[in-house]
């Protein structure tokens, strides 16, 4: 009963984590323009993944497309990357555990094969977590920096000659979104690597057998022999997505105002 | 079409308020921010605030803060603007104007002469 | 506040001839997310309220004979009357609609000459 409802918890918590995850990477608000500290302006910026959005006090919005691909920065391909796989991983994950939450029957599945594909959903969703973790990271990552970069010009006066106003941008929305379905879709995948352990047959269908030795009888139960699966070399968390080293200007290039189209 | 309906000329004493209205027909009212602009005799334009009537969100101009109070009725799609503490100078034609995209205002009432004078 | 200088303060032009008045503001009104300038041109008639007539710089609101047009980018703007007429006579009032409070030039004075 309890690994039922583990499983089934840590479906229904896995699903909530995908839907969070999609929904982040769908978004718009991914960073936001910084309203501290700064003078108050009629017009308020804000951008996603795929889209930069501008939305005028008179509540009139206009969201532009990114239409480049070759044009844009290369953390911003990577948090896309990241994101889909999650979304990719995670749909699978969904696709595969369904068939084997405990309370769908199917034929005449077996507990191991059950135990085999809760493990590998379990898998995916931990992965598809860390991506999604991983995505949102890199991107606030990329914000900081570009903060930080856009402060010291807006003191510095390194911006004499740009005629536009320094926009500064912050943790949008979107973020915690995904940080928080990220973190929901690996939780998940733990409570079905969790479940998995208990749906994989603990004893062999042996009979026990007496054997009765001179003074005393003592009865020995072959058992413990846990069903292999198969996963074990996979059990620990590969190491999803290496950015690799990069230079300051490469990590710098990402532009402060975002204008990819 | 679009029509912004002021309230009547009024004439005040030093200190006391105004309140002057303006009623919106012709579209959504909640759809569009109010702004409230003065002119004062053969002088430029000031704006003084906003207010977004479908939430009641509310923008000032610092320099009027604490004496102009911007309101919205949406039943009867109208705008208040009311200024206490009169002063003569601010003996002024006072306008509402509805803000369209681009944050300018496209439709503006015919505006009320408001003469403060002891 | 932004200040919005206008200039020339009053224009004389002969019917048929090209007006241009100047518009320049304290600090950039071109925004970086849309790359839209945040500055309108309103005319104005004696006795009348103000008609808006260019908005985001360049953009020309609908009904506006094309003989207007706006230019400029950042902090320095212009209203082009390429050919005057008699019931152009009026003043023109730049407005900041970037940058809270939202502030209008001082004017200027369009007359027959």
């Known amino acids: 009963m309890a690994v039922t409802a583990c499983q089934g918890l840590g479906f229904v918590v896995s699903l909530i984590g995908i839907a969070g995850i999609i929904a982040a990477t769908c978004m718009d608000q991914w960073s936001t323009q910084d309203l501290y500290n700064n003078p108050v302006t009629a017009v308020f910026n804000y951008q996603g993944l795929w889209r930069s959005c501008v939305r005028e006090s008179s509540g009139f919005t206009e969201c532009r497309g990114y239409f480049t691909l070759l044009g844009l920065p290369a953390m911003l391909q990577a948090v896309r990357a990241l994101m889909i796989v999650g979304i990719v991983l995670g749909a699978i994950g969904l696709l595969v555990s369904i068939f084997a939450l405990k309370c769908i029957r199917i034929g005449s599945m077996e507990d191991s094969a059950k135990a085999n594909m809760t493990l590998t959903s379990g898998i995916m969703f931990i992965v598809s977590g860390l991506c999604a973790i991983a995505g949102v990271s890199v991107f606030a990552n990329m914000l900081v920096t570009n903060f930080w970069m856009s402060t010291a010009n807006m003191y510095t006066g390194m911006g004499g000659m740009v005629q536009t106003v320094q926009t500064r941008y912050t943790f949008g929305a979107a973020l915690f979104v995904g940080w928080v379905a990220g973190g929901l879709t690996l939780i998940g995948g733990v409570m079905m690597c969790i479940a998995c352990r208990g749906l994989a047959p603990e004893e062999t269908n042996y009979k026990a057998v007496s054997y009765h030795a001179s003074g005393h009888s003592v009865a020995y139960k072959p058992g413990g022999f846990k069903a292999s699966t198969g996963f074990g070399s996979n059990t620990k968390n590969k190491k999803i997505y290496d950015g690799g080293a990069r230079t300051e200007d490469e990590v710098q290039s990402y532009p402060s105002k975002h204008d990819y189209v | 079409q679009v029509q912004l309906v002021q309230s009547g000329a009024e004439v005040k004493k030093p200190g006391s308020s105004v309140k002057v209205s303006c009623k919106a027909s012709?579209?959504?009212?909640?759809?569009?921010?109010i702004d409230w602009v003065r002119q004062a005799p053969g002088q430029g334009l000031e704006w003084m605030g906003g207010?977004?009537?479908?939430?009641?969100?509310?923008v000032y101009n610092e320099k009027f803060q604490g004496r102009v109070t911007l309101t919205a009725d949406k039943s009867s799609m109208t705008a208040y603007m009311e200024l206490s503490s009169l002063r003569s100078e601010d003996t002024a034609v006072y306008f509402c104007?509805?803000?369209?995209?681009?944050?300018?205002?496209?439709?503006w009432g015919q505006g009320t002469l408001v003469t403060v004078s002891s | 506040d932004i200040v919005m200088t206008q200039s020339p303060d009053s224009l004389a032009v002969s019917l048929g001839e090209r007006a241009t008045i100047n518009c320049k503001s304290s600090?950039?009104?071109?925004?970086?997310?849309?790359?839209?300038?945040?500055l309108t041109w309103y005319q104005q008639k004696p006795g009348q309220p103000p008609k808006l007539l260019i908005y985001?710089?360049?953009t020309r609101e609908s009904g506006v004979p094309d003989r207007f047009s706006g230019s400029g980018s950042g902090k320095d703007f212009t209203l082009t009357i390429s050919s005057l007429q008699a019931e152009d006579v009026a003043v023109y009032y730049c407005?900041?609609?970037?940058?809270?409070?939202?502030?209008f030039g001082g004017g200027t004075k369009v007359e027959i000459k």
């Open positions: 407005q900041n609609n970037y940058f809270y409070p939202l502030t």
């Open positions: 207010i977004n009537p479908g939430s009641g969100d509310t």
């Open positions: 985001w710089a360049s």
């Open positions: 012709g579209y959504t009212f909640t759809n569009y921010l």
């Open positions: 600090q950039s009104l071109l925004n970086s997310g849309n790359q839209k300038n945040y």
């Open positions: 104007a509805r803000r369209v995209r681009g944050n300018s205002f496209d439709s």
